[in-house]
């Protein structure tokens, strides 16, 4: 059988010789060089060699445990001259014993940590780790403790664990940020003689809300003239914050003042500046001066620091409005005049009236914006605003009339406003009645009297208020012995009777029928219109067959024995 | 590298003996076995004995016991094998090899033997 | 003694085809996972080559087409493919225990 225990190796061995690691033996050999004594497994015949004949093994180079700890190897002693092994083949171990030869080294060469300003005192801030090669399992060669180097009283470290925590109360971020801390792990537990490491901790303090914002001045002017639509930006104001951030973040508002009303402030989120703006339309007439207070806060407080005071400030704001020279205002956005149609040139319709708003009150000339009145219909009085005609009028060719009228300060032509004057032109019975078409209609041979034969219908282009009456009546001239008669409807339209039964077309083959059509209107408007009446041989169911191509016309108009 | 020279031939009468020779070069001589092989012509091949020449130590097929005597000459890196009454049963090619954990690596090119009157 | 049979007392193969020797011993040649069974090939006028040792080690400088297996009692030497110099007489060899035995050859010819 195999006659050895464990080996063990010192690390880092630095004689000149081989290290003699131990000896293999089987109680086989009779030390006659008859067997021979195999190595393989980790590092056989390169970092371990042995002697064939006696089993004697040897390292050949330094070993760090810290690389490899332990090396597996299989032992095999075999007769020389046949082969045959004489134990089985075995397994043992080399173990490398630990010296302190490696200092503790930190996860990371700097840290970077951050803690809130302000914190108490023993606030976690980081925890530091440094590891030793070195055997945990044997002495303190891998045993560390933590100390602090450099960033006393500001911060301490826990020996055992590395945890960084604050030593000293109210460290202020306004007053300092960054803090480089140093912090040494030392092995053999602390000890002389330990070998040591350190690290850099690079501490930030990050931001608190324990400043108010503040104004740094009380009182500000801003000027805006009286023409500033509402929206206007009149000024700026900054109150400052010493926190960063969200601690920083700034509201604005206005709190009282006349001005309260007329004017907004708003917060520039990106300059954390107030913007006054103009609320209400500004009147320098009616106000100069306005005071407002505006307030700054921080939206986002801390409860823990509200002993400190309110976290808000305010100032006062002066805003003086500036006289801006205006142009006249008319009395009325627009005016809706109204005019008979038979006005004579120079009637007066209506007037316009414009002011100068300013102090000054400066005196207005009008005129009409002949863009608007081409054709010179109109005209004004430049002085009083009075609105006449300078045209006749035709309600039937134009129903209103639009223009422009321009009111100009007479001392600064640059100042001028317009207003749009509508004009309505109302109806005057000036146009008489007349047939709807031309009437041409037939009778036939064999018609009895009485018999309707057309149906007369009027139009007239005036508009009368109580709507359009028409009566229709034969002219004077061929009422007495006429072929037909004329029966008014009373609905506007009238109907054309024949007087007799029948009629002979060679003997009168067309008549001439004037009308007399009259409206009911004031002054009353009438004309007379001629119908054309064929005499024609109609079928038994009275459709006409034939007429005569053209009627005999009389230079009257008139036929005879109509 | 290794090499086992044997002379090429040996012709003896019946009855005589003959001490064959085999030299060694290339390794370390008195550290490995030597091994003698008979093979007779046209046969399959017999282990005869071996030798340590480091100690002259030596273990032999039984059936070779009264008819081979190894021996060895460390100064000359030579081994040798003595056959006695010969007979032309013991005409055949003999060879001598290294045996190496067993196995005969390396062989030399073999002394034929004839035994005839 | 451990008697050695080899089988077939010789074979012809094609070329490029696989060969197939066995040997089987009278008794066990193998101890601790050692076997002690040995494999040589002879060409005429020449001596025996090692081309195989401890049942399945290549020795150096023989080609990889030659392997062999086998353990206890019964091993086998594999050609694969088989080329033109691999025509020879092929015998196996134990080292278990004195006296060394060899098998009776197995002729290889190739087709």
């Known amino acids: 059988s195999w006659m050895w225990n464990q080996f063990f190796l010192l690390e880092e061995y630095t004689g000149s010789d081989y290290q003699y690691v131990g000896k293999l033996h089987s109680d086989q050999d009779r030390g006659d060089g008859s067997l021979k004594y195999i190595l393989s497994g980790d590092g056989a015949g390169d970092l371990f060699i042995i002697n064939e004949n006696t089993g004697d093994i040897q390292a050949t180079k330094r070993l760090d445990r810290e690389e490899k700890p332990v090396y597996i190897l299989r032992a095999q002693a075999i007769n020389r001259r046949t082969g045959r092994p004489v134990e089985p083949e075995s397994e043992f171990i080399i173990k490398i014993h630990d010296i302190n030869d490696n200092e503790p080294i930190f996860t990371k060469e700097v840290y970077t940590a951050t803690v809130p300003e302000m914190s108490d005192v023993g606030t976690f801030v980081v925890q530091v780790t440094a590891t030793d090669a070195d055997d945990p399992t044997y002495g303190n060669s891998a045993k560390v403790v933590y100390s602090i180097l450099q960033g006393q009283p500001y911060f301490s470290v826990e020996s055992e664990t590395g945890i960084i925590k604050t030593a000293l109360l109210n460290m202020d971020r306004e007053n300092r940020e960054q803090y480089q801390v140093v912090i040494q792990a030392k092995d053999m537990g602390g000890q002389m003689g330990g070998l040591s490491g350190t690290t850099t901790v690079n501490i930030t303090l990050t931001d608190v809300n324990d400043n108010p914002p503040r104004f740094p001045q009380s009182t500000y002017q801003f000027k805006t003239p009286e023409s500033s639509p509402p929206g206007t930006p009149i000024g700026r104001i900054k109150a400052s914050d010493a926190d960063v951030g969200e601690n920083a973040e700034i509201e604005y508002s206005i709190t009282d003042g006349e001005g309260l009303d007329m004017f907004d402030v708003i917060t520039d989120q990106e300059t954390q500046e107030g913007i006054i703006t103009v609320k209400k339309l500004l009147d320098f007439e009616k106000k100069k001066v306005y005071t407002l207070k505006v307030e700054a806060s921080n939206p986002y407080v801390e409860p823990r620091f509200l002993y400190l005071g309110p976290f808000k400030d305010s100032a006062t704001v002066r805003i003086v409005v500036e006289d801006v020279d205006e142009p006249p205002v008319f009395s009325k956005l627009a005016y809706i005049l109204q005019i008979r149609e038979d006005a004579q040139i120079n009637t007066t319709i209506g007037s316009v009236t414009a002011q100068d708003p300013d102090a000054a009150r400066n005196p207005v000339k009008y005129s009409v914006d002949r863009h608007t009145d081409m054709d010179r219909i109109f005209n004004i009085d430049s002085g009083n605003g009075s609105i006449f005609t300078s045209k006749l009028l035709d309600r039937e060719t134009l129903l209103w009339h639009n223009i422009t009228v321009i009111a100009t300060e007479i001392n600064n032509p640059k100042q001028s406003s317009r207003v749009p004057l509508y004009i309505k032109v109302l109806d005057v019975n000036d146009n008489a009645p007349e047939f709807a078409e031309f009437y041409e209609t037939f009778v036939c041979e064999k018609a009895k009297a009485d018999q309707l034969i057309q149906t007369l219908h009027a139009v007239d282009k005036d508009d009368p208020y109580s709507g359009h009456q028409f009566s229709f009546s034969l002219a004077p001239e061929a009422a007495s012995g006429s072929n037909f008669t004329i029966q008014d409807n009373k609905d506007n339209t009238a109907g054309i009777l024949t007087r007799k039964n029948g009629y002979n077309r060679h003997e009168m083959s067309t008549y001439l029928l004037p009308v007399v059509i009259s409206d009911n209107d004031y002054p009353v408007q009438s004309s007379t219109g001629t119908v054309t009446v064929r005499v024609c041989a109609c079928d038994h169911h009275g459709n006409m067959q034939s007429c005569h191509a053209e009627a005999l016309i009389h230079p009257t108009g008139l036929s005879t024995g109509a | 590298q290794v090499q086992l020279q044997q002379p090429g031939a040996e012709l003896v009468k019946p009855g005589t003996s003959v001490k064959m020779s085999c030299k060694a070069s290339?390794?370390?001589?008195?550290?490995?076995?030597i091994a003698w092989v008979k093979q007779r012509p046209g046969q399959g091949l017999e282990w005869i004995g071996d030798?340590?020449?480091?100690?002259?130590?030596?273990h032999n097929n039984e059936k070779f016991n009264f008819k081979a005597t190894l021996t060895v000459d460390t100064s000359s890196n030579t081994a040798y094998m003595q056959l006695s009454s010969l007979t032309s049963e013991d005409s055949a090619v003999y060879f001598c090899a290294r045996p190496m954990l067993g196995r005969f690596d390396y062989w030399g090119q073999g002394t034929t033997l004839t035994v005839s009157s | 003694d451990i008697v050695l049979t080899q089988s077939p007392a010789s074979l012809a193969v094609s070329l490029g085809q696989r060969a197939t020797i066995s040997c089987r011993a009278s008794e066990s040649v193998s101890i601790h996972g050692t076997h002690l069974m040995h494999w040589y090939q002879q060409k005429p006028g020449q001596p025996p080559k090692l081309l195989i040792y401890?049942?399945?080690n290549l020795e150096s400088g023989v080609p990889a087409r030659f392997s062999g297996s086998g353990s206890e009692t019964d091993f086998t030497l594999n050609i694969h493919p088989v080329e033109e110099e691999d025509a020879a007489t092929y015998f196996c060899q134990q080292s278990f225990e004195d006296p060394f035995t060899f098998g009776s050859g197995t002729k290889l010819e190739i087709k």
């Open positions: 401890a049942a399945s």
């Open positions: 030798i340590y020449p480091g100690s002259g130590r030596t």
């Open positions: 290339g390794y370390t001589f008195t550290s490995d076995w």
